[in-house]
């Protein structure tokens, strides 16, 4: 698994560097679960041809997966800091189900799939010291996330892996529209 | 391989809107982490960034001209359009479009288009 | 915004000099910072992205350093074809802007 932010070469060779500002550390940590996310793209990429794919759509409708859309207040266009950091870490509470569903889904990656899970939680704590209105945070409901769960490991292996293509795909694509939205704060 | 080409026209009269198109191929506007940019090139003088639209449909314009530009896509027809108004001799210049597309949005533009000059 | 001045606004060199261009940034810009060739009536080539990543097809004399606000581009032995204005820009923070540039010219 890659290096933690904040403990990279970089930081080691300079030590009397300005320590990093809450919005650096934030998205920091966004950029290192990218690059585990890109890590397990890769295997899954090579190990399937779901990344060429035309049949997504089919997977996609079983999926609810967060996604950003101009009412979040994360677009310029109504740009609301508020809702729009509720969006954020709603979300990535709501991928933590699909992120766990991810843990035995890979064989030479293992490692990278538990830092990217463990990394997200780190990144919403982060969010919710930065968020002022906490109670509008809704935290998903563990039954269902378990059934969910359920159903999503009791698939056949091509929407298994058409699955796993999916989550990583929608995953990365929420945390950059995140990562755009954040450094507007 | 990537390729981008703008196109419109090339002479514009004062306080009339300028439309251009910038026709892209090799890459898809849907995919997440891929914008396209234009800019705009006086004679003789530095780059200056006017507007931006991403794969997601947001949009980012330069403020000291935001009234003025509008940035639009047709990811069907893989085409970005930018629309200025009230132009002035002051908006001479080549105006280019380009591509930028990396996971942390680091807006580095790896490709651009020939760049169409606006007298 | 973000200003970003570089210097020297104009630079004479001799083929296999190696020579040093200058980029500050009004603010700290982290690794946001890339730089551009641009040849007399040609549209501007990506050169080295994220402060020191080189580009593919990009030759290995350039090369890229410096982080928060101070970045140096370096061409480790000028050839004739290096020729042109130098351009560093902002990715950092919108409005995306860009350096007055740096001509290179031939002595």
């Known amino acids: 698994a890659p290096v933690p932010p904040g403990e990279d070469s970089k930081d080691v060779a300079a030590p009397h560097r300005q320590p990093l500002t809450s919005s650096e550390r934030i998205d920091k940590q966004i950029r290192y679960i990218l690059d585990g996310i890109s890590a397990l793209r890769k295997e899954t990429c090579n190990k399937s041809n779901m990344c060429e794919s035309s049949k997504e759509a089919l997977a996609e409708n079983n999926l609810n997966l967060p996604k950003m859309a101009e009412k979040d207040g994360c677009f310029q266009s109504g740009f609301n800091e508020e809702t729009c950091l509720v969006k954020i870490i709603t979300g990535l509470l709501e991928f933590e189900v699909y992120l766990e569903y991810l843990q035995n889904r890979f064989e030479s990656s293992e490692e990278q799939a538990r830092a990217v899970q463990m990394s997200t939680k780190v990144l919403i704590q982060f969010l919710q010291k930065k968020a002022k209105n906490l109670d509008a945070i809704t935290t998903p409901d563990p039954t269902t996330n378990a059934s969910l769960l359920t159903k999503l490991q009791a698939q056949n292996q091509w929407l298994q892996d058409m699955t796993t293509h999916l989550i990583l795909r929608s995953f990365k694509e929420f945390l950059q529209s995140s990562l755009r939205a954040l450094r507007q704060m | 391989q990537v390729t981008l080409k703008e196109s419109g026209p090339t002479l514009v009269k004062p306080t009339q809107t300028l439309t251009l198109t910038c026709t892209f191929s090799g890459f898809s506007l849907r995919t997440s982490g891929v914008s396209v940019g234009w800019f705009r090139q006086p004679p003789g003088k530095a780059l200056e960034w006017l507007a931006l639209?991403?794969?997601?449909?947001?949009?980012r314009y330069n403020p000291s001209l935001k009234n003025r530009l509008t940035i639009t896509r047709d990811t069907s027809k893989n085409q970005v359009v930018l629309t200025m108004t009230n132009m002035d001799p002051v908006d001479t210049a080549t105006y280019y479009c380009?591509?930028?597309?990396?996971?942390?949005?680091?807006?580095?533009?790896?490709?651009w288009g020939q760049g169409t000059l606006v007298t | 915004d973000i200003v970003m001045t570089q210097s020297p606004a104009t630079l004479s060199v001799t083929p296999g000099d190696r020579v040093s261009l200058s980029c500050r940034a009004s603010q700290s810009i982290s690794d946001y910072l890339h730089w551009y060739q641009q040849k007399s009536h040609e549209s501007p080539r990506l050169l080295i992205k994220?402060?020191?990543q080189s580009i593919s097809g990009i030759p290995s004399r350039f090369s890229g350093s410096g982080s928060g606000s101070d970045f140096t581009l370096s061409i480790n032995s000028v050839e004739p074809e290096d020729v042109g204005v130098y351009y560093c820009q902002n990715g950092h923070s919108f409005p995306l802007t860009f350096g007055a540039g740096t001509k290179l010219e031939l002595k």
């Open positions: 639209v991403y794969w997601d449909d947001d949009r």
């Open positions: 380009a591509r930028s597309y990396d996971d942390y949005l680091y807006y580095a533009l790896d490709y």
């Open positions: 994220s402060v020191s």
